[in-house]
Interface confidence: low
Amino acid sequence: QTDMSRKAFVFPKESDTSYVSLKAPLTKPLKAFTVCLHFYTELSSTRGYSIFSYATKRQDNEILIFWSKDIGYSFTVGGSEILFEVPEVTVAPVHICTSWESASGIVEFWVDGKPRVRKSLKKGYTVGAEASIILGQEQDSFGGNFEGSQSLVGDIGNVNMWDFVLSPDEINTIYLGGPFSPNVLNWRALKYEVQGEVFTKPQLWP
C-alpha cells in the first residue's frame, strides 16, 4: 500500500501499453458505488479517452468513465451508456465524482463540485466484484485489448471509490479537500501496479 497523497500518475504520451492497474479489496458484487478523481489533459477537443475503466470477465465495460469528443462525459454501467454533455471544453484540471445505485438506477455526475441532472441506468443490475481496474487505457477485454486512440495523455490522481452513494454534502467535502474514508479504492493507501511509461509526480491541482 502506498500513500499517494498530493501525487498523480502522469501518462506523457499516447500508447496502448502504458497503464496503472488498481487493486480493490472487493469480495461481493456492488449494488452501488461512487468514484471520485482528478484528471488533467489537453485531449478533450482532439479525441476521446478513458478516465476510469473497471472490467469483469462478464463485461469489459462494467464501469467506464470516458470522454467522448464533441459530446462530453460517457458513463457506462454493465455495458449500457449515458452521456453528460459538455458544451465548452477548457484545458484545466477537472474533479469528477460519479455514483450509481442499483435500486433506482440513478446516476449522479458531478463536475468540479457541481451536479449534472440525475439520469437513470441499469436499474436492478449488479456490478461484478472480480474486477480489473485500469487507469490510462480502456479495456476491451478483461485486463487488456487496449487501443492507443483511447488512452489518456495527461495526469490523473485522487482516485477514490466507495461501495455506496455519497451524499451531496460528502461530494462537496471531497471536492473541497476535506476528510473522507473510501472503502474500495483509497488514494492514501493505494495498491497498484504500473505498466509501461507512467510516472508519479506531484499533483498540479490545488
Partner: antibody, heavy 123, light 107 residues
C-alpha cells in the same frame, strides 16, 4: 447543421404495411440514439420507438401501442433511420417525425425534429 | 408508465401578459423534463431541457422551474410569435411520455 428528412408516408389500407425512412445529415449519426415520434391529426405527441447507437448494441424500445407491429432499425453507413410498420390500424394514422436525441444516449430531450411524413390508414 | 398531467389545456391571453403552464409527473422524474413549442403546421421545437435550461436560441422571456414533481414553464411579456401549443415531456426512463398539451391563443 443537423437535418432530418422523413419519407415513405402515404395512404395504406388497414392491416397493410409501410416503411418510413429518415435521412440524417450534419452530425455524427452513429453516435446518437434516434427516435420516431408521431402526432395524430389534431392530437398530442406520442413517442413511438427508440434505437440506440452501436456502442449500446443497437438496443430498441417501443411504445406498448406499437410493440410487435413496428420495427425500428438504422444503417449507420448510410446515415439512415427506418420504421417498418406492419398490421397497420386506423389509430396509427399520424404525422411521423424522425427525432434525434440530445447528448444523452439513454433517456433524453429531443432538440432535433424532421418535418414529418404523413401516414393515413384507411379503407 | 409515468403520466404527465399538463394544465391548463388552453389559455387565451393578450400580447405583453405573463403566463405559466404547469406539468405534474406521476412520480419523481428528477428534473428530467423538457418543454416544446409547436406552431400550426410545424414540427415541435425544444424550448427547455433538464427542467430549467434554455435551449439554444430560445429568448430569455422563457424560463423553466421545478417544485417537487410539478414543473412550470413561464413566459414573460408574451409576443405574437409565442402563440401555439406547448408540450412537456419527461425523459426519465422509457417510455418518454408527453403531456397533453396547452394551447396558447391570442385574446
Amino acid at each position: 447543421e443537423v437535418q432530418l428528412e422523413e419519407s415513405g408516408g402515404g395512404l395504406v389500407q388497414p392491416k397493410g404495411s409501410l416503411k418510413l425512412s429518415c435521412a440524417a445529415s450534419g452530425f455524427s449519426f452513429n453516435t446518437y440514439a434516434m427516435n420516431w415520434v408521431r402526432q395524430a391529426p389534431g392530437k398530442g405527441l406520442e413517442w413511438v420507438a427508440l434505437i440506440r447507437s452501436k456502442s449500446n448494441n443497437y438496443e430498441t424500445n417501443y411504445a406498448d401501442s406499437v410493440k410487435d407491429r413496428f420495427s425500428i432499425s438504422r444503417d449507420d453507413s448510410e446515415n439512415m433511420l427506418y420504421l417498418q410498420m406492419n398490421n397497420l390500424k386506423s389509430e396509427d394514422s399520424a404525422m411521423y417525425y424522425c427525432v434525434r436525441h440530445g447528448a444523452v444516449v439513454e433517456g433524453a430531450w429531443f432538440p432535433y425534429w424532421g418535418q414529418g411524413t404523413l401516414v393515413t390508414v384507411s379503407a | 408508465d409515468i403520466v404527465m398531467t399538463q394544465s391548463p389545456a388552453s389559455l387565451s391571453v393578450s400580447v405583453g401578459e405573463t403566463v405559466t403552464i404547469t406539468c405534474r409527473a406521476s412520480e419523481n422524474i428528477y428534473s428530467n423534463l423538457a418543454w416544446y413549442q409547436q406552431k400550426q403546421g410545424n414540427s415541435p421545437q425544444l424550448l427547455v431541457y433538464a427542467a430549467t435550461n434554455l435551449a439554444d436560441g430560445v429568448p430569455s422571456r422563457f424560463s423553466g422551474s421545478v417544485s417537487g414533481t410539478q414543473y412550470s414553464l413561464k413566459i414573460n411579456s408574451l409576443q405574437s410569435e409565442d402563440f401555439g401549443i406547448y408540450y412537456c415531456q419527461h425523459f426519465w426512463g422509457s417510455p418518454p411520455t408527453f403531456g397533453g398539451g396547452t394551447k396558447l391563443e391570442i385574446k
